[in-house]
Structures are given as C-alpha cells and as structure tokens.
C-alpha cells in the first residue's frame, strides 16, 4: 500500500506520458488520476515504467474498478498485465479475440504463466467452445497448448478447429488426448483424397483404432517409423505382417532397429515367426511354427 500524500505543486499529471518515469511511487499515487489512467491506458505500454511503478498504477485501477476492469482497459494493459493475479483475471469478462491476442503478446516467448492460463480459461469458457480462430491464436503463442488440455476439455473442440492444428502442436499429447482428437481430425479431413488425407491425419494417428490402420495399409501411404512408434499398442497388435509391410512401405526396414521397443516388440510377439521371416529383416521373437495361438480375450467374451 502506498501512503496517501498530497501531490506536490505543479506535478499533477495532465496526461500519461514519459515524464512520469521520473515520479517516485508516492508521487504517482498522489499525482495520477485513476480515471485519466484508465482512459489513456494505451500509452502505458509505450513508457518504460518499472516493476514498482506498475504496482502503483495497478493499485489505482483496482480502486477505480473493484469489481474487475472493463474490456476497454484490459485490451490496453500491456506489461501491466504481468502484475495481475489469477484472482484479478477471474473478475474479467474478456470476449474479444483482439484483447486476448494483445495480452498474450505481452508474455510472448515466455512460459505460460498462471495469469495466462487463467485468462485463456476465462476466454474459452466465455465462448463456450474452442473455435478455430481461438485455437489458431493460442497454438501460435503456445504450440503445446492443445496438449495441456484434459480429454474432457478437448471434447469441446469442434472438428472445424482441427484445421488450425500443426504437427508440432501435438508433440506433447498423450494417448488419452489423441483418442479424443483423432475422431475429430478424421471428420475434419474426410473429404480429402488419399495422400493429402494422410499428410493431415498423420499427426493424430496416435489415437487411431486398428480398423483405420488396416484401411490406411491399403492406400500406399508409406508411414514413417516415427509415426508408427506413436501408434496405440492395442491398435497395432491385430495387424498382420502383410498389413504392416503395406502400411510402412519402404520404411518397413526400420522395424529391425525398433524391435525391442513398443509397439514393435509386442507386435512381434503376436506374429508367426515364418510370417516375420518373409520380411527378411531378421526379426526374432515370433510364435514358432506349429504352435497354436489362443485368443483368450475372445474366449472370455464367449463364455
């Protein structure tokens, strides 16, 4: 708290300008009118106010708007946004994408702070869903944003928004998140032809079921090993050697280097050794010839 002291003669601020950087904290408190500050917020960011001076300016706005700042002020907060607490931000009603962009710009190049996370949460909840323009904006500032959402939150992403997602936006997504995103991507890209479809869907395939992988194997897609290694193990296990060979195309040779890692290791254990031998890669660990394979899960379902 800054003590209430009278403004020295001749120091009353008539406008928000660079001369204010020479004001002490108590002078800013005494000589800057909160209403003037609110109407000239757009000037604050153009002036190199210190951390301590920004504290005083925030205090003035808090007194003027105890119930939360109006959007006209929020949009021009600039670096003053860094002084806000999540509690402050929860009082706001931010509806404009321009306001969101302006505030994200302030923290650009830095990790997502609790303030930014709260702001995004407020904004998205206010809109009711994560529309394409919002997702475009958020992933531009924070490529990992999508993967920071829970599967429940991701369920509110409309398929049309999937067009805004870039491969790097999914780098840190786990299988549970891809399980939610994959069906949306499939829907979003359904009208594309084979090769174009594969380019778009590739990043989402960590959520694809077996039947979709089987379908892709019939389309000469030449999936790379990096994508294959991110597939769900339970989706890969039922694939035959022939289907994996078609799915990977010339990349099938990469299986040898990955034979000790999931899902390749688990898939090898499910294949007949003589089928694996047809690949000519020296993959070992398949079911020996003459052995009978019992699918116990199927047996349980029948009993």
């Amino acid at each position: 708290e800054v003590e209430k002291t009278a403004c020295p003669s001749g120091k009353k601020a008539r406008e928000i300008d660079e001369s204010l950087i020479f004001y002490k904290k108590w002078e800013l408190e005494a000589c800057v009118d909160a209403a003037l500050l609110a109407t000239q917020m757009d000037r604050v960011n153009a002036i190199p106010f210190t951390y301590e001076q920004l504290d005083v300016l925030k205090h003035k706005l808090d007194e003027l708007y105890p119930q939360g700042y109006p959007e006209s002020v929020i949009q021009h907060l600039g670096y003053l946004f860094l002084k806000m607490s999540p509690e402050d931000i929860r009082k706001w009603n931010v509806t404009s994408l321009e306001t969101l962009k302006a505030l994200l710009e302030v923290n650009k190049g830095h990790e997502m702070s609790p303030q930014v996370a709260t702001l995004i949460d407020r904004f998205v909840k206010g809109r009711g869903q994560l529309d394409k323009d919002t997702l475009d904006t958020l992933t531009a500032f924070y490529p990992g944003y999508l993967c920071s959402l829970s599967p429940e939150e991701l369920s509110s992403v409309p398929p049309s928004s999937i067009w805004a997602v870039r491969p790097q936006d999914l780098d840190t997504c786990d299988p549970r998140q891809l399980d939610v995103l994959y069906p949306k991507a499939r829907l979003a890209f359904q009208n594309m032809n084979g090769s174009e479809y594969f380019v778009k869907i590739q990043s989402f395939l960590g959520g694809a079921p077996t039947e979709d992988l089987k379908a892709l194997s019939q389309q000469n897609v030449s999936m790379d090993l990096a994508t294959f290694m991110k597939l769900r193990t339970d989706a890969v296990l039922p694939l035959t050697v022939a289907e994996v060979q078609k799915l990977l195309g010339p990349h099938v040779e990469g299986l040898k280097a990955e034979e000790r890692h999931r899902p390749v290791r688990d898939w090898i254990l499910r294949q007949r050794q003589d089928d694996l031998d047809t690949l000519g890669l020296g993959l070992q660990g398949g079911i020996p010839n003459g052995y009978l394979v019992l699918d116990l899960s199927m047996q349980e379902a029948l009993s």
Epitope: P48, F49, Y51, E52, Y79, G109
Partner: nanobody, 114 residues
Framework: VQLVESGGGLVQPGGSLRLSCAAS????????VAWYRQAPGEQREPVAA???????IYADSVKGRFTISRDNAKNTVYLQMNSLKPEDTAVYYC??????????WGQGTSVTVS
C-alpha cells in the same frame, strides 16, 4: 531475457563514455527502454528513456550531456555520456519491456568519474 551492459570505466571529469546494452530476443526493437543508475547507498533512478515511439526524455541532472539511442538491427541500446561529473559516478543499468515489468535486471556497468 538477458541484459548485458558494457562500456563503463574510470574517466576524468569532463570526459566521455559510451555505454551499450545488448538484449536477447527482439526486446529493444519493440519496447520502450531506459537507462538507470544507482550510486552507492542510493536508490536506483532513471537517467534517460526512449518510448516505443522513439521520443526521448532525460533527468534534469543529465539534460544536454547524455543521449539515449538504439540500434534495432543489433537489438542494442546506447547511452552517450559527455561532460561527465563526479556525481555521475554510479552503476548504470538498462532495461525495458518484459524484464523491466517483471523486475529483472542485468549486472550493470560501473562508471567512476574521478
């Protein structure tokens, strides 16, 4: 954000120095910036500032002697100090934008006029 000030040293009264401040990223090209100084036992105070629009302002004590400028291509801010006086002795810091708002400072560069 890293701020690296340089160019300080020992100089005789009436002499000149040119301080430089380099920042990581594109911090100075887009933001308002300022030079500050802190004399022994004193509070840090602003000396010269440049708004994001490019207008400059100086503390009364250095007006006419100091000049702030910036080179956006090099992401560097300068402080040309002429007609130096013993009372200009201090550690000089530059700052602006995100780091200034967050209260992060560089090491500063020491100027001694004697």
């Amino acid at each position: 954000v890293q701020l690296v000030e340089s160019g300080g040293g020992l100089v005789q009264p009436g002499g000149s120095l040119r301080l430089s401040c380099a920042a990581s990223g594109s911090m100075f090209s887009i933001n308002a910036v300022a030079w500050y100084r802190q004399a022994p036992g004193e509070q840090r105070e602003p000396v010269a500032a440049m708004t994001s629009g490019g207008s400059t302002i100086y503390a009364d004590s250095v007006k006419g002697r100091f000049t702030i400028s910036r080179d956006n291509a090099k992401n560097t801010v300068y402080l040309q100090m002429n007609s130096l006086k013993p009372e200009d002795t201090a550690v000089y810091y530059c700052n602006g934008g995100w780091s200034l708002a967050m209260g992060y400072w560089g090491q500063g560069t020491s100027v001694t006029v004697s």
